[in-house]
Interface confidence: medium
């Protein structure tokens, strides 16, 4: 995939919804300038494309939702990269601009005559993209044309600012809540000294900023904070790991507000530098319970505690997806490429036959093999349904008693659609209520996952807790098996009786040396010794002074 030719998935309809999915990985550092995307992605790419296509089929066959109106879509590849996504968003806008200048699809020719060439329908709204940084760039463009955007995994706190991102909404909570959940976990296990890493870009930067602010208020110290690009090279990851080891053995916990591929980069560097078991990674929802993050590097990831947005698997999606085959799936233009990549084989005689694979794909291959549903599938589907319900509510108010698109609704006014979307309230795919607050955000519910060795060379994610609107619940026994196994991540141990903390110049407040008070001094507070007044002496527990009993000497007393 290079910048000169981009593939698009179309589905016809009366109203067209745009979507941006990361069908391919982002370009590597050396390919960024030519916007050449990486390998095809299953969970974040193909599954989301299929979810869009199939969800629209379900909506279109539901007589109670948008009766007599067919929803279609135009799906484009964001490659998890701002430049690519912007280029694709401009294509969405171009469609809108052309359509608004034409009357009912009749193109006015230069010589004044009219042509019956029907132009493409405008995009009324956009689903996605996944990354916060990319979503911000896309929103900056879409809002200029009053096109609402509903995100399914862009969680950056910045996107809550409606003065900057008026046409942005999301079916996921803001990262401020996730940062709070991470701090609550750190507090629970008395980790007062941790290292911090975040992915360069909006998601990581704003999330880590919130984590650090909340940590400071809770008396948690950050040994050092580092940032790294997701697509950084081995050398950068190795250097970062080397820096993290300089804070061992004190800062064993590394809080990572990171995209999944950043975590994978860290795990790979741990393998290269032999640091398996040295750190406990506390990861944000960029990692969650993704196997593509840990595959091949399970030993390095063991013990990791991660935050995952609460979203159960969607059974009906699997029922549909697992039956798909390259011979019959023609509406997804990336499917053949994906099939060959997934099974490392060549689809002989197919239009997208890839000669780099020697083995020919046999007909017994099935997506059921090692199938893992995208962890955010529920959110992707809820975002699509939100758009449908928003349009449905708009149709009900603008076209009362009318089935289909009435004149009052044509062309669709983005401002009215946004108004309608903000009022949307429906039961989501997993039975939870989908609604939006005044910032276009959804409420925060997270699962806490723990990556464990379940048996010899068998590893998996286990649900060990939840965080729901400020309340953390953790199964400590499941995480640690016994109290003594709880990892320590502290800079200095508490001082003993009669000692005070001395914080060295330039050190954080969690790092001190313990110094005993002098013989005639007591511990006034944790940082200060005070001398007892004349005639008094420190108490046994060295927390105050007692008067020294007066002893009168008489002539006959023996010498003391």
């Amino acid at each position: 995939q290079s910048s000169e030719r981009r593939v698009v998935a179309h589905m016809p309809g009366d109203i067209i919804i745009g979507a941006l999915f990361s069908v391919h990985h982002q370009p590597t550092v050396d390919k960024v300038h030519e916007r050449k995307c990486g390998a095809v992605r299953e969970q974040y790419g193909i599954q989301r494309v299929e979810a869009m296509l199939h969800t629209l089929e379900r909506i279109n066959s539901d007589p109670t939702l948008l009766p007599n109106i067919t929803l279609g879509c135009e799906i484009r590849d964001s490659c998890w990269h701002s430049a690519v996504a912007l280029e694709q968003s401009i294509e969405f806008i171009r469609d809108s601009l052309i359509s608004s200048e034409e009357e009912e699809g009749l193109v006015r020719c230069v010589d004044g005559s009219s042509s019956s060439f029907r132009s493409k329908k405008p995009i009324v709204g956009v689903i996605g993209p996944g990354s916060s940084s990319v979503a911000i760039q896309v929103q900056n463009l879409l809002q200029l044309f009053n096109i609402p955007q509903i995100a399914y995994s862009a969680t950056s706190m910045d996107l809550s600012d409606k003065t900057l991102f008026k046409y942005f909404m999301r079916v996921v909570p803001s990262d401020a809540q996730q940062a709070r959940a991470m701090v609550d976990i750190v507090k629970r296990y008395n980790w007062t000294y941790v290292s911090a890493v975040h992915t360069e870009g909006n998601y990581g930067e704003s999330g880590m900023e919130a984590f650090k602010d909340m940590s400071a208020k809770e008396g948690i110290c950050i040994a050092h904070s580092y940032k790294i690009y997701s697509n950084a090279g081995e050398q950068s990851f190795d250097k970062l790991l080397k820096k993290l080891t300089s804070h061992l053995p004190k800062a064993r916990v590394v809080a990572c507000f990171c995209e999944g591929m950043t975590v994978r980069g860290l795990l790979m560097a741990m393998r290269r530098l032999g640091l398996a078991g040295e750190f406990l990674l506390l990861g944000s929802d960029g990692w969650a319970d993704r196997y593509d993050v840990t595959d091949g590097y399970q030993r390095e990831a063991v013990g990791g505690i991660t935050i995952k947005l609460q979203s159960p698997d969607v059974k009906w999606f699997d029922d549909y997806y697992l039956k798909l085959r390259p011979e019959t799936n023609h509406r997804n233009p990336w499917f053949q490429e994906f099939w060959q990549h997934r099974f490392q084989c060549r689809l002989e005689g197919f239009p997208q036959e890839n000669s780099k694979y020697n083995k020919t794909c046999n007909s017994s291959l099935t997506l059921k093999t090692h199938h893992v549903q995208d962890s955010k599938m529920g959110f992707v589907i809820n975002a699509i349904y939100s758009m449908a319900y928003g349009l449905h509510n708009m149709q009900m108010s603008l076209c009362p008693g009318y089935a289909g698109l009435c004149d009052a609704m044509k062309p669709i006014d983005g401002r009215k659609l946004l108004e309608s979307l903000m009022k949307t309230n429906f039961t989501g795919v997993s039975g939870d209520t989908i609604l939006f607050d005044e910032n276009g955000d959804s409420p925060g519910r997270y699962e806490i996952m723990n990556f464990k060795e379940m048996g010899k060379d068998y590893f998996d994610y286990i649900n060990v807790g939840s965080w729901d609107n400020g309340e953390l619940k953790m199964d400590d026994d499941e995480v640690w098996s016994k109290k003594s196994n709880i990892i320590r991540s502290v800079c200095s141990e508490p001082c003993e009786k009669g000692q005070i903390k001395v914080i060295r110049k330039g050190e954080v407040s969690c790092c001190w040396t313990c110094t005993p008070c002098k013989e005639n001094e007591y511990v006034f507070d944790e940082y200060t010794c005070k001398a007892c007044q004349l005639g008094s002496w420190p108490t046994d527990d060295l927390t105050g002074c007692d008067l020294i009993p007066v002893q009168y000497l008489r002539w006959g007393d023996p010498e003391p």
Epitope: D238, R271, R272, G274, A276, R299
Partner: antibody, heavy 118, light 109 residues
Framework: SLEESGGGLVQPGASLTLTCTAS?????????ICWVRQAPGKGLEWIGC???????TWYASWVNGRVTISSTSSTTVTLQVNSLTAADTATYFC?????????????WGQGTLVTVSS | DVVMTQTPASVSAAVGGTVTIKCQAS??????LAWYQQKPGQPPKLLIY???TLASGVSSRFKGSGSGTEFTLTISGVQCADAATYYC???????????FGGGTEVVVK
């Protein structure tokens, strides 16, 4: 194979640079190239390693900044030791650690003898 | 760095007998342990890596076992050619280092 060079008689307080040269393979692949020494009649003592893929180094804790390992080309790694004393008299080996065998050392040079004496 | 303690310092065995060498790490190194054989005037030779995996071309008379902090090298059916000094090595590298045990001299009678 690996071959060490640069050993010999050195004055106390002086510096020394030893070179490890590879033949039959290239350091541009990802290996740990490590240095070890063995005093006469004594055991093996690890000095430090360099990861040829990214230039990251690890040193034994006793080294205390006196040693520098660097990769000078795709086939040579050097060991520089400063402020030499009689206790540094030893045979110095370089060895290769490979990821295929969990970073154990499958290839060793024959060693070069360094004698520190006035 | 991890400290590796090897016992015994020296052991003698009759041809055909069995020799057991123990190695203890000061902290858990999982299975990140290698065993080497060194003969006078030669560099060490890798016998076992990952605590129990036999290196290429090494006789199956050499057997490694253990994990965590306790490891064992067993030489069965001892032959004259096995007379050498044997070293264990932590290959946990990273912050553990690649430290060696003190060595065990095997004398074959």
């Amino acid at each position: 194979s690996l071959e060490e060079s640069g050993g010999g008689l050195v004055q106390p307080g002086a510096s020394l640079t030893l070179t490890c040269t590879a033949s039959g393979f290239s350091f541009s692949s990802n290996y740990w190239i490590c240095w070890v020494r063995q005093a006469p009649g004594k055991g093996l003592e690890w000095i430090g390693c360099i990861y040829t893929g990214t230039g990251i180094t690890w040193y034994a804790s006793w080294v205390n900044g006196r040693v520098t390992i660097s990769s000078t080309s795709s086939t040579t790694v050097t060991l520089q030791v400063n402020s030499l004393t009689a206790a540094d008299t030893a045979t110095y080996f370089c060895a290769r650690g490979s990821g295929d065998i969990a970073w154990a050392w499958d290839l060793w040079g024959q060693g070069t003898l360094v004698t520190v004496s006035s | 760095d991890v400290v590796m303690t090897q016992t015994p310092a020296s052991v003698s065995a009759a041809v055909g007998g069995t020799v057991t060498i123990k190695c203890q790490a000061s902290q858990s190194i999982y299975t990140n342990l290698a065993w080497y054989q060194q003969k006078p005037g030669q560099p060490p030779k890798l016998l076992i890596y990952k605590a129990s995996t036999l290196a290429s071309g090494v006789s199956s008379r050499f057997k490694g076992s253990g994990s965590g902090t306790e490891f064992t090298l067993t030489i069965s059916g001892v032959q004259c050619a096995d007379a050498a000094t044997y070293y264990c090595q932590c290959t946990g590298y990273g912050s553990s280092g690649w430290t060696f045990g003190g060595g065990t001299e095997v004398v074959v009678k």
